[in-house]
C-alpha cells in the first residue's frame, strides 16, 4: 500500500511540476517542486531496495562503453596536446581533502561539496574541483612557479540533468599558471590554449566571454550594492545567461533584498557586451571611472586585448558584462566559452550544453592555505570534457560513423585446422616487435568466422597462415581497405604491417 | 521513538515576541520538511509556515508574513518559530509537524502543541 | 487561497454504522487531499493522503476516494474510538487549507 501511494504521489508531482511549467512559474517554485519530485522518486528508489535490489550507477554517475572510451580518449588526446605544446608539467592529487581545505572557498556552490562518513580521525570531502587542490598543492610545497596540467574526477552533489552532459562525477581538464609574471601575458596564454582546443575538437562554433571580478565589484559598488551583498548578487547577474534580465531583477528585488532603482543600475551595465571599444567607452563611464577597482580591471582588459590581437585570437573573445561566475575565489580576469551553435542534424534538436570551458584568475587562493598568507598569482581554464564527450557522441551517433574502439592493427588467423601453435607463435612475435596484434581464442576457427570478427572489429590487417603458405615461408596478409591479399615472406611480415599501418618502429 | 515536542508558549502582550521550538527526535531531521500549524481555541486548524530540509525553501502565510519567521538547526534536530508583534488573533495552540514521504505537504507526525495566547 | 468545504458539519451515528464525510475543493486539487482525525486536547492524526491512500498503522475502515474537487472519506463500520472531529486538507498549493471540520458524534 505505501508503494502505491508513493507512485501516486511521484504520479501526481510530476503533473504538479508540469503545470507549473505550463503557467510559465517563476524559476524558483519549479526548482521547488523538482526538488520535491527528486525526492519522492528517491524514496520510492529506496522503497523499491527493500523488495528487489535494482542493479544501476549511482545518480549522477555513469559507465562508459568501449565505444564511449574510445571518443573520450581522442578528445583527451587533443587536450593533452595542446597542454603540453604550451609546455606544461602534469601532477596529481587526492581524490578527497581534508574537509578544511575545501570549506569557504565556492561560495554558494559550497553546498554541493560531498562530505564523506567520519572514519573516526580526519574531517574528509571529496574535491569539487582541481584548482583548489593545486592552490592546496602549491602552499604546502612552498612553490612560487608552475605551469601544470591536472586531468581528473571531480564530484558534485548536483541534480544534474545528464542528457545535457552534466554530472555528479565528472573529468575536470585544468591548466593553470602560478607565479609573478609581466600582467596579461599568461592570462592571454590561457585564452589562446582554450581556444587551440575548442578549434581543434571541432564541435562547433563558440565564442568566449571576459569579464573581470574588480569590473564586477566597481560596477556593485557604483550602482550602490552594499559590500555584504556582492556575491549573492554576482550569482544573480551569472543566470543572465539562462534567464531574462526580467527574472534576475526580481530575484535581486525580492529575494535579496535590493533595492529596485540599484537592480536598475546594474542592468545598465550588465546588459552590455561587445569587444575592447567596450572597454574604452567604461573607462570613459562617469561613475566607473571613478571607481580604482573596476579602472585597474579595465586597464587589464585592455592590455590583454591587444595580446589576444597578437595571439589571433580577438574575433572569438566577447567582453560581457553579465559574466560573473560562481566561485569565490576568482580576483580577477573570468572566462567562460560557449557554443553559439551545436553541429546538429536536419530536424534534431540542438543540444543545449551551456559552458564548454572557462577559468581566470586566483592571486588569492594559494594565500588562504600559506601559515604566513603568501599569496601566489595563478591563472587557468577548466575544460568542460564531460560536455564534450556528449556533444561528440550525439555527433557520431547522427553520422552512423563507425568508431574503433580497439588499437589492433592486425588479426593472426589461420585457414585450417590445427594451426593454434603457429597462431600463438607468429601472434607472439608480432608482440615482441611492438605491433598491436589479436587472435581468436579458439583451437580450430572457421575461416569465415575470424574474417568476420576482423571486419566488425575494424581490424586494418588480418595474417592467414595456410599448411601451404606455411611450407612455402610465407603468410597471406590481407587489407580490410582494399580487400587485396599478398603473400608476404615471414621474416618481412613485421616490416610489412608497419609500412601499411604508418607505425614506426617501436618495441614494448 | 519518533516524537516531536513543541515548547515555548505562554501569555504574551499584544505586540510582543515570542519564540517557539520543536525538538524532533527518531528520524532523520534534515531529511524532511517541517511546518508551523495553528489552531485558534474552538476552531479549525491553519497552516503557517513551512521549511525545507535545507533550509532553501520558506512560506509563510499572508497573516504572519513579515512578523514571523520559521527556521531549523539540524545539528540539534530542532525547529523554531520567531513570532513577533504579536496580535490577538494570533492566540492558539501551535503544532509543528512533519512533511509526509519528506516533501508532500500532508502532516503524517505531530507534536502535542504548545499554547500561545495574546492578551492584555 | 484555494477554499475547502466539508459537509456536513456534524453528523451523529451510532457504532457499527457507515459513515460518509464530503469535501469540497474550490477549484481542481487532482488528488493533493489528506484527512486527519483529531480528538479534544490531542493533535490531528494522519488517516488518508493522497486522497485515497491510507496512512500506515489506520485501521483500513477508514478508506478515502474522490480527484479534483470531490473527495469523500469513508468509515465502514464506526467504532468507539473512532467519534472525534474529522479535517480535509489540500496539499496542491500554498497556503494549504483545512476544511472547517466536521464533528462525529454518538447517536
Known amino acids: 500500500a505505501d508503494r502505491a501511494a508513493l507512485e501516486e504521489l511521484v504520479r501526481l508531482q510530476g503533473a504538479h511540476v508540469r503545470g507549473l511549467k505550463e503557467q510559465k512559474a517563476s524559476a524558483e517554485q519549479i526548482e521547488e517542486e523538482v526538488t520535491k519530485l527528486l525526492k519522492l522518486k528517491a524514496q520510492l528508489g529506496q522503497d523499491e531496495g527493500k523488495q528487489k535490489f535494482v542493479l544501476k550507477t549511482p545518480k549522477g554517475t555513469r559507465d562508459y562503453s568501449p565505444r564511449q572510451m574510445a571518443v573520450r580518449e581522442k578528445v583527451f588526446d587533443v587536450i593533452i596536446r595542446c597542454f603540453k605544446r604550451h609546455g606544461a608539467e602534469v601532477i596529481d592529487t587526492p581524490v578527497f581533502e581534508l574537509k578544511e581545505t575545501l570549506t569557504g572557498k565556492y561560495g554558494e556552490d559550497s553546498k554541493l561539496i560531498y562530505d564523506l562518513k567520519d572514519q573516526g580521525g580526519e574531517l574528509l570531502s571529496l574535491r569539487y574541483d582541481l584548482t583548489v587542490p593545486f592552490a592546496r598543492y602549491l602552499a604546502m610545497n612552498k612553490l612560487t612557479n608552475i605551469k601544470r596540467y591536472h586531468i581528473a574526477k571531480v564530484y558534485r552533489r548536483d541534480n544534474p540533468a545528464m542528457t545535457r552532459g552534466r554530472y555528479r562525477e565528472f573529468y575536470q581538464c585544468d591548466f593553470d599558471i602560478a607565479g609573478q609574471f609581466d600582467p596579461m601575458i599568461p592570462d592571454a596564454e590561457c585564452l589562446k590554449i582554450m581556444c587551440e582546443i575548442l578549434s581543434s575538437l571541432q564541435i562547433g562554433n563558440f565564442l568566449v566571454k571576459v569579464n573581470d571580478r574588480r569590473i564586477l565589484d566597481g560596477m556593485f559598488a557604483v550602482c550602490g550594492v552594499p559590500d555584504s551583498k556582492f556575491r549573492t548578487i554576482c550569482s544573480s547577474v551569472d543566470k543572465l545567461d539562462k534567464v531574462s534580465w526580467e527574472e534576475v531583477k526580481n530575484e535581486m528585488v525580492g529575494e535579496k533584498g535590493l533595492a529596485p532603482e540599484v537592480a536598475d543600475r546594474i542592468g545598465d551595465y550588465v546588459q552590455q557586451h561587445g569587444g575592447v571599444s567596450l572597454v574604452e567607452q567604461l573607462l570613459q563611464d562617469p561613475k566607473l571611472s571613478q571607481n580604482k577597482q573596476a579602472v585597474e580591471g579595465l586597464g587589464d582588459l585592455k592590455l590583454l586585448f591587444e595580446y589576444l590581437i597578437l595571439f589571433g585570437i580577438d574575433d572569438k573573445i566577447s567582453f560581457d558584462l553579465s559574466l560573473a561566475r560562481g566561485l569565490d575565489y576568482y580576483t580577477g580576469v573570468i572566462y567562460e566559452a560557449v557554443l553559439l551553435q551545436m553541429p546538429t542534424q536536419a530536424g534534431e534538436e540542438p543540444l543545449g550544453v551551456g559552458s564548454i570551458a572557462a577559468g581566470g584568475r586566483y592571486d588569492g587562493l594559494v594565500g588562504m592555505f600559506d601559515p604566513k598568507g603568501r599569496k601566489v598569482p595563478c591563472v587557468g581554464l577548466s575544460i568542460g570534457v564531460e560536455r564534450i564527450f556528449s556533444i561528440v557522441e550525439q555527433r557520431l551517433e547522427a553520422s552512423e560513423e563507425k568508431v574503433r574502439t580497439t588499437e589492433t592493427q592486425v588479426l593472426v588467423a589461420s585457414a585450417q585446422k590445427k594451426l593454434l601453435e603457429e597462431r600463438l607463435k607468429l601472434v607472439s612475435e608480432l608482440w615482441d616487435a611492438g605491433i598491436k596484434a589479436e587472435l581468436l581464442y579458439k583451437k580450430n576457427p572457421k575461416l569465415l568466422n575470424q574474417l568476420q570478427y576482423w571486419e566488425e572489429a575494424g581490424i586494418p590487417l588480418v595474417a592467414i597462415i595456410g599448411e601451404q603458405e606455411l611450407r612455402d615461408g610465407v603468410i597471406k596478409l590481407r587489407s580490410v581497405a582494399s580487400r587485396e591479399e599478398v603473400d608476404v615472406r615471414r621474416e618481412d611480415l613485421v616490416e610489412e604491417i608497419r609500412r601499411r599501418t604508418n607505425q614506426p618502429l617501436s618495441t614494448c | 521513538q519518533v516524537q516531536l515536542v513543541e515548547s515555548g508558549g505562554g501569555l504574551v502582550k499584544p505586540g510582543g515576541s515570542l519564540r517557539l521550538s520543536c525538538a524532533a527526535s527518531g528520524f532523520t531531521f534534515s531529511d524532511y520538511y517541517m511546518t508551523w500549524i495553528r489552531q485558534a481555541p474552538g476552531k479549525g486548524l491553519e497552516w503557517v509556515s513551512y521549511?525545507?530540509?535545507?533550509?532553501?525553501?520558506?512560506n509563510y502565510a499572508d497573516k504572519v508574513k513579515g512578523r514571523f519567521t520559521i527556521s531549523r538547526d539540524n545539528a540539534k534536530n530542532s525547529l523554531y518559530l520567531q513570532m513577533n508583534s504579536l496580535r490577538d488573533e494570533d492566540t492558539a495552540v501551535y503544532f509543528c509537524?512533519?512533511?509526509?514521504?519528506?516533501?508532500?505537504?500532508?502532516?503524517?507526525?505531530w507534536g502535542q502543541g504548545t499554547l500561545v495566547t495574546v492578551s492584555s | 487561497d484555494i477554499q475547502m468545504t466539508q459537509s456536513p458539519s456534524s453528523v451523529s451515528a451510532s457504532v457499527g454504522d457507515r459513515v460518509t464525510i464530503t469535501c469540497r475543493a474550490s477549484q481542481g486539487i487532482s488528488s493533493w487531499l489528506a484527512w486527519y482525525q483529531q480528538k479534544p486536547g490531542r493533535a490531528p492524526k494522519l488517516l488518508i493522503f493522497?486522497?485515497?491512500s491510507l496512512q500506515s498503522g489506520v485501521p483500513s475502515r477508514f478508506s478515502g476516494s474522490g480527484s479534483g474537487t470531490h473527495f469523500t472519506l469513508t468509515i465502514s463500520s464506526l467504532q468507539p474510538e473512532d467519534f472525534a472531529t474529522y479535517y480535509c486538507q489540500q496539499a496542491e498549493s500554498f497556503p494549504y487549507t483545512f476544511g472547517q471540520g466536521t464533528k462525529l458524534e454518538i447517536k
Open positions: 493522497a486522497a485515497s
Open positions: 509537524a512533519r512533511y509526509v514521504y519528506q516533501v508532500v505537504a500532508i502532516g503524517d507526525l
Open positions: 521549511i525545507s530540509g535545507s533550509f532553501r525553501y520558506t
